[in-house]
Interface confidence: medium
């Protein structure tokens, strides 16, 4: 969590002199409670916006907007504390609006905005706006909170942001996985325009279980420049016994911009469909026997359906 460009953090507007300050997320009014405190924010809205840095990079930001209630407590409103909590890490970042002049009622409802919290793709945040001073212990709360889910890098607008491009969002490997027979998977994917290695992560599961029954990491060496954007194929030779027939193939690139943390793409192959009714036993004897072992190879109708999805 960070703020986009510390320059030009503005909260002043006509009729209000205001400054934005860094905050420890522990306002002084917690420690020294006041008798008279303002009411809570109204209509807190969080939206995904995109902002350029001075260097020209594009980042997703949380656009925070709220209004004031039309009651006399605005006379005691000294500012606001904006807090963003990243839920999976418990990391919190706060800023404080400090009002340098008294608020007065005017013909329009007071509205405040702030768009400088940089957020990460595929993360959830809790955004809280506290009016200051904070209430006395056991006083009515004067804050409003909302959760905000940032889309992942598959989202069209997110895909072109700097953090997504850095993690390889523009690479579409167009993975295809084909079951050649019960023991062979063929994986095809398109290489990116960078001489970097890839890993294929294979995880196999029994038909209706989520316990893996096989896992393997397979290293693909860095392609040469003439192989950029070309299709690469990998044959995974399995021992498909124990009903270990549902395979998830995940491709992990190691681009220089994201190293071990690049977006992974995956495809899944399902177990072959089981016939609803058992094959009828023929009422005649065949005149020939199949060659030893040949019956172990399944026909084309044994091919598991393969579908393509992305995973981060």
């Amino acid at each position: 969590l960070r703020l986009l460009d510390h320059r030009a953090l503005v909260c002043s507007q006509p009729g209000l002199n205001c400054t934005v300050k860094n905050s420890t997320c522990l306002d002084d009014s917690w420690i020294h409670p006041r008798n008279l405190t303002p009411s809570s924010p109204k209509d807190l809205q969080i939206q995904l916006h995109f902002a350029h840095t001075q260097q020209g990079d594009l980042f997703p930001v949380a656009h925070i907007e709220w209004t004031l209630q039309t009651d006399a407590s605005i006379l005691y409103l000294e500012g606001a504390e904006l807090s963003v909590l990243q839920l999976n890490t418990n990391e919190r970042l706060c800023v404080r609006f400090e009002f340098l002049s008294k608020l007065r009622h005017h013909h329009r409802r007071w509205r405040f905005t702030f768009s400088h919290f940089v957020v990460d793709p595929d993360q959830e945040y809790e955004v809280t706006v506290h009016h200051l001073p904070k209430p006395i212990p056991d006083g009515d709360p004067n804050h409003q909170s909302k959760n905000f889910l940032v889309p992942d890098c598959e989202h069209a607008r997110m895909k072109v942001t700097t953090p997504c491009m850095s993690s390889g969002s523009l690479w579409d490997p167009n993975i295809t996985v084909e079951t050649l027979d019960t023991q062979h998977l063929r994986v095809d994917f398109t290489l990116w325009n960078e001489s970097t290695h890839y890993q294929i992560l294979l995880t196999s599961f029994p038909h209706m279980e989520n316990h893996s029954c096989f896992e393997h990491m397979h290293h693909i060496p860095a392609p040469r420049p003439e192989e950029f954007h070309q299709r690469s194929n990998v044959t995974l030779t399995l021992r498909n016994l124990k009903g270990c027939c549902r395979h998830q193939v995940q491709i992990q690139p190691f681009f220089s911009s994201c190293l071990n943390d690049c977006l992974r793409h995956s495809a899944t192959v399902s177990c072959p469909e089981m016939p609803d009714t058992p094959e009828p036993i023929p009422d005649y004897m065949p005149l020939w026997e199949p060659r030893s072992g040949s019956s172990d190879y399944k026909d084309d109708d044994d091919k598991g359906s393969s579908h393509h999805h992305h995973h981060h």
């Epitope: 294979l202 893996s212 896992e215 393997h216 044959t235 021992r239």
Partner: antibody, heavy 131, light 107 residues
Framework: QVQLQESGPGLVKPSETLSLTCTVS????????WNWIRQSPGKGLEWIGD???????NYNPSLKSRVTISVDTSKNQFSLKLSSVTTADTAVYYC?????????????????????????WGQGTTVTVSS | DILMTQSPSSLSASVGDRVTITCRAS??????LGWYQQKPGKAPKRLIY???SLQSGVPSRFSGSGSGTEFTLTISSLQPEDFATYYC?????????FGPGTKVDIK
């Protein structure tokens, strides 16, 4: 290199439960199947069952109703429990690792093989079922 | 279950002899077969995997061949330390099954 060591009581009473543990040293329990095999006196080898480090199990149908195999990845151990034992369960019990990997690289085309089959065995522990 | 049979069940041979042991599967198992050597009081030791691949550290006098239902273990020149019992193991389908063994002793 990987070594396996079976441990557990050498004598079990009929109708009780036989419990054995196999400790894996010199390598990780991850990404392999781990097997139990037994050999009755003067008889051949019988596969009891196996477990993948994720907990996925496979049992010999002839013993399935009495067998439980479990794994403790934090201790690098896997265990066998065989319930309602009789004198016919007297045997040397072995634990063994299953699996061998091989990779082949070509120009733009790669192959990966996985071979099942027990390649590393414990030295075995004798269990006698007797009252 | 896949039934594995071995022949002969025992054989007597001299040092330097060429020895061949056969293993048959009751149904096709591709090349999903290993050969194991066991000496008295010891655990089995794998010699061959995938029907014909020599296990690392095993002398080259041991070789395996076959696919489908018929497999062969050959010892090209029997050495004193090779007197033991030999088992085949199929790992094509559950349950894994071993052959009954072939005991090789000194003539």
């Amino acid at each position: 290199q990987v070594q396996l060591q079976e441990s557990g009581p050498g004598l079990v009473k009929p109708s009780e439960t036989l419990s054995l543990t196999c400790t894996v040293s010199g390598g990780s329990i991850s990404n392999y199947y781990w097997n139990w095999i037994r050999q009755s006196p003067g008889k051949g080898l019988e596969w009891i069952g196996d477990i993948y480090y994720s907990g996925s199990t496979n049992y010999n149908p002839s013993l399935k109703s009495r067998v439980t195999i479990s794994v403790d990845t934090s201790k690098n151990q896997f265990s066998l429990k065989l319930s309602s034992v009789t004198t016919a369960d007297t045997a040397v019990y072995y634990c063994a690792r299953d699996g061998e990997l091989a990779n082949y690289y070509g120009s733009g085309s790669y192959q990966f093989y996985y071979y099942y089959g027990m390649d590393v065995w414990g030295q075995g522990t004798t269990v006698t079922v007797s009252s | 279950d896949i039934l594995m049979t071995q022949s002969p069940s025992s054989l007597s041979a001299s040092v330097g002899d060429r020895v061949t042991i056969t293993c048959r599967a009751s149904q096709g198992i591709r090349n999903d077969l290993g050969w194991y050597q066991q000496k008295p009081g010891k655990a089995p030791k794998r010699l061959i995997y995938a029907a014909s691949s020599l296990q690392s550290g095993v002398p080259s006098r041991f070789s395996g061949s076959g696919s489908g239902t018929e497999f062969t273990l050959t010892i090209s020149s029997l050495q004193p330390e090779d007197f033991a019992t030999y088992y085949c193991l199929q790992h094509n389908s559950n349950p894994f099954t071993f052959g009954p063994g072939t005991k090789v002793d000194i003539k």
